[in-house]
Amino acid sequence: FERTRSLQDPCSNCPAGTFCDNNRNQICSPCPPNSFSSAGGQRTCDICRQCKGVFRTRKECSSTSNAECDCTPGFHCLGAGCSMCEQDCKQGQELTKKGCKDCCFGTFNDQKRGICRPWTNCSLDGKSVLVNGTKERDVVCGPSPADLSPGASSVTPPAPAREPGHSPQ
């Protein structure tokens, strides 16, 4: 079938990086500068994407593949193929319609993008809070209060003045 198709359609012999030039008796011509064809048998080459302004070039365009963009410093990619750039925030913040806002108490964000997420509820797993959460970091859950009862071996014994497993507010 491939052989008969190529006999019927000379364009099917044109490899990626070329196009089937109707103006030149259907011979395979190289893609012009700033254009590409990623598959064989193309009758035209596609214009290369230009990474300008908020976009930076991550990968240059070649005759067989489009350019790939990422975002200028202070922004990160959104959407398929980095179709938009979104402003970074600091860790401990999230981006709202009015800009970067600190995470509310009880939530954290350890990245420059995305939303603030609630701290882990250690008690749901029968554990206690070993390290308190912050705007930038989740809580660290430790052994369950039962594991810290007298006689049980623990790396750091609880302070005698406080009930084990409870963290200061």
């Epitope: 908020v54 976009f55 959104l78 179709s83 938009m84 750039c85 979104e86 402003q87 981006l95 800009g99």
Partner: nanobody, 117 residues
Amino acid sequence: QVQLQESGGGWVQPGGSLRLSCAASGFAFRDFTMSWARQAPGERFEWISSINPSGGSQSYLPSVKGRFTISRDNAKNTMFLQMDNLTPEDTAVYFCARGTRYKMSTSGPGTQVTVSS
């Protein structure tokens, strides 16, 4: 395919004025907030101004407020930036962008603005 084409840049003396234009195609221009941004040599890409879809609400970078005016003509799919009382610090490549100051895309080559005596 979204296309944005900036024009109107040039050389001007301090205190002078320029009017930039942005011709948009390939999307429903009247439905989008549009923005202007700029990048000076060796500096970070910087948002300058945004205008909502109807043109009734504008916002500005504090350092350009009172000197720059953003506007749009939805019938002609065009956005403008009137720049008055220009200073050497305004020297940069100016880009028009689809979207807000926090989330945007650019596709044009930009237009160079040079302010010097």
